[in-house]
Amino acid sequence: LRLLDHRALVCSQPGLNCTVKNSTCLDDSWIHPRNLTPSSPKDLQIQLHFAHTQQGDLFPVAHIEWTLQTDASILYLEGAELSVLQLNTNERLCVRFEFLSKLRHHHRRWRFTFSHFVVDPDQEYEVTVHHLPKPIPDGDPNHQSKNFLVPDCEHARMKVTTPCMSSGSLWDPNITVETLEAHQLRVSFTLWNESTHYQILLTSFPHMENHSCFEHMHHIPAPRPEEFHQRSNVTLTLRNLKGCCRHQVQIQPFFSSCLNDCLRHSATVSCPEMPDTPEPIPDYMPLW
């Protein structure tokens, strides 16, 4: 988790002087509780947005937006703490909106936004906005939390972001798999424009089951420049196991930008359709 660039972040708007500060996620009001505290945020919304860094790289960011409740507690609102928690790693990053002037009621509801938390593809987050000062230990909570899911690199907009491109999102191998005679599979895919090796991972399953009955790995050496964007054809031999008929072929590239952690592509061959009630074959041919 990180903030997009480190240029001056702005939270001021007409009628409010405000500055964005780094935060330890432990506001002073936890340690020194105040008697009067503001109510919680209203209508917290988290959306996926995309933003360029000063270097021109494109990153997915969490766009956080919320409004204030129209009650007198805004007179005691000194700011807000924005927190993004990555669920799996428990990593948390916070910033603080510090209000440098008192809020006043005006003709429309106060609305705040922040779009500088960089998020990772295919990761899950919990976003919390805490109004400051935080409540006394037994006081009503004055925060609102929402969960937020970032799509993976197959998502159209995500595909062209810097982290996705670094993991090989622009490579479309267009995998085809066909079943040949004598328990063989023919795998064909398009090579990328990089002299790097590939690995084909074959996993076979019985019909309607998820426990594999055969696994095989095939190494493809790095192509020469004249082979870039060409089709690579590989024939894999299957184990002659009755019913081990559903095959998943996964291709793992080892591009220099992502090494062992590149996006993998896969294709599946289903088991052949079984006829519902096969016609009985007579043991003898009648003479009439």
């Epitope: 988290i46 959306q47 799996n88 428990n90 899950e124 939390s145 929402k146 899911l149």
Partner: antibody, heavy 116, light 107 residues
Amino acid sequence: QVQLVQSGAEVKKPGASVKVSCKASGYTFTSYGISWVRQAPGQGLEWMGWISAYNGNTKYAQKLQGRVTMTTDTSTSTVYMELRSLRSDDTAVYYCARKQLVFDYWGQGTLVTVSS
Amino acid sequence: EIVMTQSPATLSVSPGERATLSCRASQSISTSLAWYQQKPGQAPRLLIYGTSTRATGIPARFSGSGSGTEFTLTISSLQSEDFAVYFCQQYDIWPLTFGGGTKVEIK
């Protein structure tokens, strides 16, 4: 090929405990959390909670708090779900699933029957 | 907790026809909604997340729409393998909750 393989069916008496395992393969185990979802016979799906495969952090459904414990063993890429003080209404198929908000890969399910 | 309500409970459709399934949340969940398909004796399969984003490998005949409290899953032309039970799930706030399911059966 991402796979989550669960332990076999269990029959337990009321008041007993059950521990179901879920072994993950085909991806970097610590990159995603594992959630548990159960389904009573002929019923819908009920979220039970999740565990972070990265650091063992957990979040449980409030109604199961105090009865459920989820643990992880990174050396074997296995997650465990233990449910204690079993009751007849805990009879269900228990599924492990990858991720913590939306579940993209699921185990095959483990039927736990609670009967005296 | 947020209550998810699916309708209808059962939907009878002929192969090749369009199926429209509804899911309603008891409060606004923005677009934090997923859809799953479950066939008898099998685990659920993720179809759609973020209201409208198809999961990896899901055919284009499945599409999702909606926002706030009203959501729809549309199967444009039902194939034989699409007859199953469909569940919606919100992941906006804890606890995560599922709808009761819609069974899509052959007419």
